[in-house]
């Protein structure tokens, strides 16, 4: 009897193992996405980045889904979110139309069923990129922890996107889950 | 009989509780390191920067290890990388050499197995310290998730490393695992 | 006996399914605090910041306390603590006392037993804001990985706090726990 | 109804110097970057020089660099173009283009004036 | 800089019939930073379309731009007698901007 007993206890702390790390994988969505440089609008004002990168170099998801430009949450929880923003100038890639800008980003949160957009963070600066300068660089970090639900979109939204860097290490977003929702 | 079940299961319980407790620290290597100022080499290029503290003050580390400037990855998983650098000039520290300064910051993969190395963020911005101010202050944050595999190494280059700021709340970077590869 | 020691497995499996969903939710305590605009004080020199909101838009709290413009620490453990902190200016706000600024964001920790405070991170940058632009915005952001213990206190502390960008996706903080102390 | 009026153009002889005016309206001038683009006769369209709305930042093309100079008046809501060391290939008709002000870069031409021929030679 | 070649040099067709014009540049234009035009005997240059595929306001729908990278098409779907003229295409990716040499679409 004794035996049968802790043959049971092993099977019991085997298939816990096993449970509590398939668990806690599936229990822990995330993406990184990366900015597709090939579809990049132009403007000076705020637009809203569609195209992105999810497979390729650094870019990964799991457990999320990326559609129509938006990172779509499948899972309740409270994640982790995050934005990278990029912007630079080159003398060769085009004169500038003013050198006073506004360079910003705006991780926006829109929920489907009640549609409306609010944004989650914002960042950036005002610039004063002269042509006395061949070269112009600045980057924008923000990130934050947020209560997202299932079928809710976070998306991108930046100012000036003509002078976006398409570089995979500047250019990017993203989110991991932390916690369940109580 | 049922006396014995329940003992087993109290043992069961309790092993499970340490077992989780035990393997769930296990699971979760950080490390956040602190500039180490005595050791920050000259010049205004791109620069690897190799001294870092690992055990002083703010920094401390733990399943992971330190090695010839590098952050080495003991442990698979997806990780969430940081980094904030801080740059400052007074004028008592001497002129600068130019006014138009790029004060930039790259977190850098390199995978010992395939010797390569790539820059997983950058960040920073273009400066203009003028000499009709006397002090000039510039921070740069970057952060994403990234998967990393054991013996990968984790560094920081960045330009202007004369112009570091030494303190350990300024000039730092991190990283801590947040889930197993699937 | 068999069928009873099945039993006694599926209460094992149940209760720990209960224990493991409700102890992960409880060793993760969260906070996302959002600026209150209408208490900031005025000034140019270094100010810490009281008046934060824990429970409307997106700021929430959980297993943490906020308390006299403090952000306390209930339990034991590593967090990933962030700040976001936007300054903006409008010529239609009035003239700036000076076109050079320091911008800056402290966060630091108090500890009780101890009496003392420590910038855990810092950030910012100078600016020079011509009047020759009518609109000029900046923001900072910082994040790290820290060590606390029950008790301690977190603040933020900014320079030129009548800049600040009132907005709750525009200058907050939070902390959320990665995982406990060995 | 935005309107660009160029002035200025005429015959000079090689090395000789000329300015074109462009007097616009129907537009908050300051705030829209501004160029000459330039048609030799029979020919196509050649982007000159060009100057952002603060006038802080000029640009010009390699084959114009040193000679010519762009500026603005945003008080009189005036471009001009002053061309010293005139050579005959400089001979076109210069056309005064507003940016479109949409993006951050200087991007495509619209609209056009009707243009101001400059005729170099002896 | 980019050089813009533009084929084919004369498009002979009559009224009513499909116009395809190509634009090819030696090198990828960034963010498909491209426009056309459309120039009239004594006239100046009109913008047809700016950002490869965006018509300009005012112009019929007719007129059509698509393409990225180094190729990028003018298709006028059905030619009308007042659209005979000379297009010009012209990148403003890169500096200095350029224009292509032009094609004349002429009628038949």
């Known amino acids: 009897g004794s035996q049968h007993i802790r043959a049971e206890k092993a099977m019991v702390d085997g298939s816990w193992l096993d449970l509590a790390k398939r668990s806690k994988l599936e229990a822990q969505p995330f993406a990184h996405l990366t900015i597709n440089a090939t579809d990049i609008p132009s403007g000076s004002h705020k637009v809203s980045l569609s195209s992105w990168y999810h497979d390729r170099g650094w870019a990964k998801i799991s457990n999320m889904t990326f559609s129509n430009g938006k990172l779509i949450v499948n899972q309740d929880g409270f994640y982790y979110l995050y934005a990278n923003i990029c912007f630079r100038h080159h003398e060769t890639s085009g004169d500038l139309a003013t050198e006073y800008l506004q360079l910003m980003v705006y991780v926006t949160k829109t929920s489907i069923k009640i549609p409306s957009s609010h944004t989650l963070m914002k960042g950036g600066s005002t610039k004063y990129w002269s042509g006395n300068s061949e070269f112009h660089f600045y980057s924008i970090n923000v990130g934050g922890f947020f209560k997202l639900r299932s079928g809710e979109e976070i998306s991108i939204e930046v100012s000036n996107p003509s002078l976006l860097d398409p570089d995979q290490d500047a250019t990017y977003f993203g989110a991991f889950k932390v916690r369940d929702i109580d | 009989g049922s006396q014995h079940i329940r003992a087993e299961k109290a043992m069961v319980d309790g092993s499970w509780l340490d077992l989780a407790k035990r393997s769930k620290l296990e699971a979760q290597p950080f490390a956040h390191l602190t500039i180490n100022a005595t050791d920050i080499p000259s010049g205004s290029h791109k620069v690897s920067l190799s001294s870092w503290y690992h055990d002083r003050g703010w920094a401390k580390i733990s399943n992971m290890t330190f090695s010839n400037g590098k952050l080495i990855v003991n442990q698979d998983g997806f990780y969430y990388l940081y980094a904030n650098i801080c740059f400052r000039h007074h004028e008592t520290s001497g002129d600068l050499a130019t006014e138009y300064l790029q004060l930039m910051v790259y977190v850098t993969k390199t995978s010992i197995k395939i010797p390569s190395s790539h820059t997983l963020m950058k960040g920073g911005s273009t400066k203009y310290w003028s000499g009709n101010s006397e002090f000039h202050f510039y921070s740069i944050n970057v952060g994403g998730f990234f998967k990393l595999r054991s013996g990968e190494e984790i560094s920081i280059e960045v330009s202007n490393p004369s112009l570091l700021d030494p303190d350990q709340d300024a000039t730092y970077f991190g990283a801590f695992k947040v889930r197993d590869i699937d | 006996g068999s069928q009873h020691i099945r039993a006694e497995k599926a209460m094992v499996d149940g209760s720990w399914l209960d224990l493991a969903k409700r102890s992960k939710l409880e060793a993760q305590p969260f906070a996302h605090l959002t600026i209150n605009a209408t208490d900031i004080p005025s000034g140019s020199h270094k100010v810490s910041l009281s008046s934060w909101y824990h429970d409307r838009g997106w700021a929430k709290i959980s297993n943490m306390t906020f308390s006299n413009g403090k952000l306390i620490v209930n339990q034991d453990g590593f967090y990933y603590l962030y700040a976001n902190i936007c300054f903006r200016h409008h010529e239609t706000s009035g003239d700036l006392a000076t076109e050079y600024l320091q911008l800056m964001v402290y966060v630091t920790k108090t500890s009780i037993k101890i009496p003392s405070s420590h910038t855990l991170m810092k950030g910012g940058s100078t600016k020079y804001w011509s009047g020759n632009s009518e609109f000029h915005f900046y923001s900072i952001n910082v994040g790290g990985f820290f060590k606390l213990r029950s008790g301690e206190e977190i603040s933020i502390e900014v320079s030129n706090p009548s800049l600040l960008d009132p907005d709750q996706d525009a200058t907050y903080f939070g902390a959320f726990k990665v995982r406990d102390i060995d | 109804e935005v309107q660009l009026l160029e002035s200025g153009g005429g015959l000079v002889q090689p090395g000789g110097s000329l300015r074109l005016s462009c007097a616009a309206s129907g537009f908050t001038f300051s705030s829209y970057a501004m160029s000459w683009v330039r048609q030799a006769p029979g020919k196509g369209l050649e982007w000159v020089s060009g100057i952002t709305g603060s006038g802080g930042s000029t640009y010009y093309a390699d084959s114009v660099k040193g000679r010519f100079t762009i500026s603005r008046d945003n008080s009189k809501n005036t471009l001009y173009l002053q061309m010293n060391s005139l050579r005959a290939e400089d001979t076109a008709v210069y056309y005064c283009v507003k940016d479109p002000g949409t993006t951050s870069i200087m991007s495509w031409f619209d609209p056009w004036g009707q243009g101001t021929l400059v005729t170099v030679s002896s | 800089e980019i050089v813009l070649t533009q084929s084919p040099g004369t498009l002979s067709l009559s009224p009513g019939e499909r116009a395809t014009l190509s634009c090819r540049a030696s090198q990828s234009v960034r963010g498909r930073y491209l426009a056309w035009y459309q120039q009239k005997p004594g006239q100046a240059p009109r913008l047809l379309i700016y950002?490869?595929?965006s018509r300009a306001t005012g112009i019929p729908d007719r007129f059509s731009g698509s393409g990225s990278g180094t190729d990028f098409t003018l298709t006028i779907s059905r030619l009308e007698p007042e659209d005979f003229a000379v297009f010009y295409c012209q990148q403003y990716g890169s500096s200095p901007r350029t224009f292509g040499q032009g094609t004349k679409v002429e009628i038949k």
């Open positions: 950002g490869a595929s």
